[in-house]
Amino acid sequence: TQHGIRLPLRSGLGGAPLGLRLPRETDEEPEEPGRRGSFVEMVDNLRGKSGQGYYVEMTVGSPPQTLNILVDTGSSNFAVGAAPHPFLHRYYQRQLSSTYRDLRKGVYVPYTQGKWEGELGTDLVSIPHGPNVTVRANIAAITESDKFFINGSNWEGILGLAYAEIARPDDSLEPFFDSLVKQTHVPNLFSLQLCGAGFPLNQSEVLASVGGSMIIGGIDHSLYTGSLWYTPIRREWYYEVIIVRVEINGQDLKMDCKEYNYDKSIVDSGTTNLRLPKKVFEAAVKSIKAASSTEKFPDGFWLGEQLVCWQAGTTPWNIFPVISLYLMGEVTNQSFRITILPQQYLRPVEDVATSQDDCYKFAISQSSTGTVMGAVIMEGFYVVFDRARKRIGFAVSACHVHDEFRTAAVEGPFVTLDMEDCGYNIPQTDESTLMTGRA
């Protein structure tokens, strides 16, 4: 099919088409009151796309100022544009908020490329398509930035959903989600369904389309199929997990599993690509090239730089392999695997050739800071950030793009020994010197 089948975002909600649904497995965990079921008001509350990030609407201040905020599980600051910028349609105007409190403290966040800096304060914050609560949260008012805001992305700030340990300027600055849980009865859990379109969206299409769902405080059954499988959060800073095995089309990469997690593996909605440590990236690309050898592509494509185009509807998905990441399970010596399709790791790009072509960038790239399971991975799955139980759950997303032959999968259990040895122990240095490089 032209762009692969895109499953509907929901079944029977708000008049959405029923479309194709994968059969639900029956061996699910028992219901947990208040944490599972239907969260209709939060379904479809995200917009955006993998290349520029997914954002949720939030209000800040009194009277409320509405802003679109990037959902980022790879950082821990709530930071919003607070001064005019060429790429911002609107920004937080602290002087107009009667509830703003200045913390009289600055914050500076450098990235590998770019940076932002601002002034810390607190204000009242709510999420219109979220829980019906208002919380006083720390806010970094961004006054200066470089290569941070994205032209045409339609978001004006960032919601860092990771833990206090990586908050800037230091771990004493309480992240938004911690404030939310402390001040309300919202359970300490959120879940994300990021929906890649499978084809490029222009600016107006992004604004009109659904990008997915952020369910705050629970799990919505309509957003996934099959079972949820959980992997432990190794350490509460980033959402760090442990990968124990990697396969390309079922072929084991056969590397020391420590390499997969060197120097960490994280789940990060604010990163576009699946990023892999240098050695792992090279082995993976070699294997993907071998699997797709009936066609050859230039080196620049494998570096994520050049676009490859095919006549519309003729993208040869079948020549590209599936990629499986095995994650440590909750039970000793037990793992499970998540499998993504080329429909996830070939990212559709705005048409730079002609409207008669479908063009893609290779969305797996090299990392010097460990594995980053970015949007291209997350777009295949419904991902549950169960902070209360220090675990992350994966299930097949009801909106993932696939074709008639293959689908993304979450499968287990598998027997895997010595999984603890797969984790890398970072030498203890001052964490504040870490660069937060993202791509």
Epitope: E295, F297, D299, G300, E305, V352
Partner: antibody, heavy 120, light 108 residues
Framework: QLQLQESGPGLVKPSETLSLTCTVS??????????WGWIRQPPGKGLEWIGN???????YYNPSLRGRVTISVDTSKNQFSLKLSSVTAADTAVYYC????????????WGRGTLVTVSS | EIVLTQSPATLSLSPGERATLSCRAS??????LAWFQQKPGQAPRLLIY???NRATGIPARFSGSGSGTDFTLTISSLEPEDFAVYYC??????????FGGGTKVEIK
């Protein structure tokens, strides 16, 4: 030293099919290091890419010519061919075959070209 | 579609002079750009690839520069055999498809 040589009729009638062959000598068309392509140049005008082929048979075509163009490869003869159907006077051009090298990116070796005139 | 605009259309210079040819892309093509030389009655010849790398056998007087949207081919001192038409081509979008309209370097 690898060389490319185009061959085929120099005159084709309107609405008929233009057929050209490129013979590769001094090297193998089955090399995994190259794609092979066709480019044309109307008299006094610029260059227009027609399409590419890999020895496995995988093809890419210029969107403006799709539906009319077919490129095929015969590894046993070390040749690849171009067919362009339903030709008009606008298809009159010098047709070049070329090798796409430098990591499949650049046309680094060209045939001398053959002029094909479409006229009744 | 990425459009490559070459300027000037014609450049009239004398042997020994420096020639500067421009190629502008309608959107960024990174460094994925080539320059070709074509003499009358001959096939094009690859001069420069990846914006600045000289192809095999190309004299050092030819140099390429630029990235993103603006590229330059410079011939430091024109030799009689350099009078020809020069084309740029982008390969950021693959397979390579777009050529510029050409710049003719003629004897003044």
């Amino acid at each position: 030293q690898l060389q490319l040589q185009e061959s085929g009729p120099g005159l084709v009638k309107p609405s008929e099919t233009l057929s050209l062959t490129c013979t590769v000598s001094g090297g193998s068309i089955s090399s995994s290091s190259y794609y092979w392509g066709w480019i044309r140049q109307p008299p006094g005008k610029g260059l227009e890419w027609i399409g590419n082929i890999y020895y496995s048979g995988s093809t890419y075509y210029n969107p403006s010519l799709r539906g009319r163009v077919t490129i095929s490869v015969d590894t046993s003869k070390n040749q690849f061919s171009l067919k362009l159907s339903s030709v008009t006077a606008a298809d009159t051009a010098v047709y070049y075959c070329a090798r796409l090298g430098h990591g499949y990116n650049y046309f680094d070796l060209w045939g001398r070209g053959t002029l094909v005139t479409v006229s009744s | 579609e990425i459009v490559l605009t070459q300027s000037p259309a014609t450049l009239s210079l004398s042997p020994g002079e420096r020639a500067t040819l421009s190629c502008r892309a309608s959107q960024s093509v990174s460094s994925y750009l080539a320059w070709f030389q074509q003499k009358p009655g001959q096939a094009p010849r690859l001069l420069i690839y990846d914006a600045s790398n000289r192809a095999t056998g190309i004299p050092a007087r030819f140099s390429g520069s630029g990235s993103g949207t603006d590229f330059t081919l410079t011939i430091s001192s024109l030799e009689p055999e350099d009078f020809a038409v020069y084309y740029c081509q982008q390969v950021y979008v693959w397979p390579p498809r777009t050529f510029g309209g050409g710049t003719k370097v003629e004897i003044k």
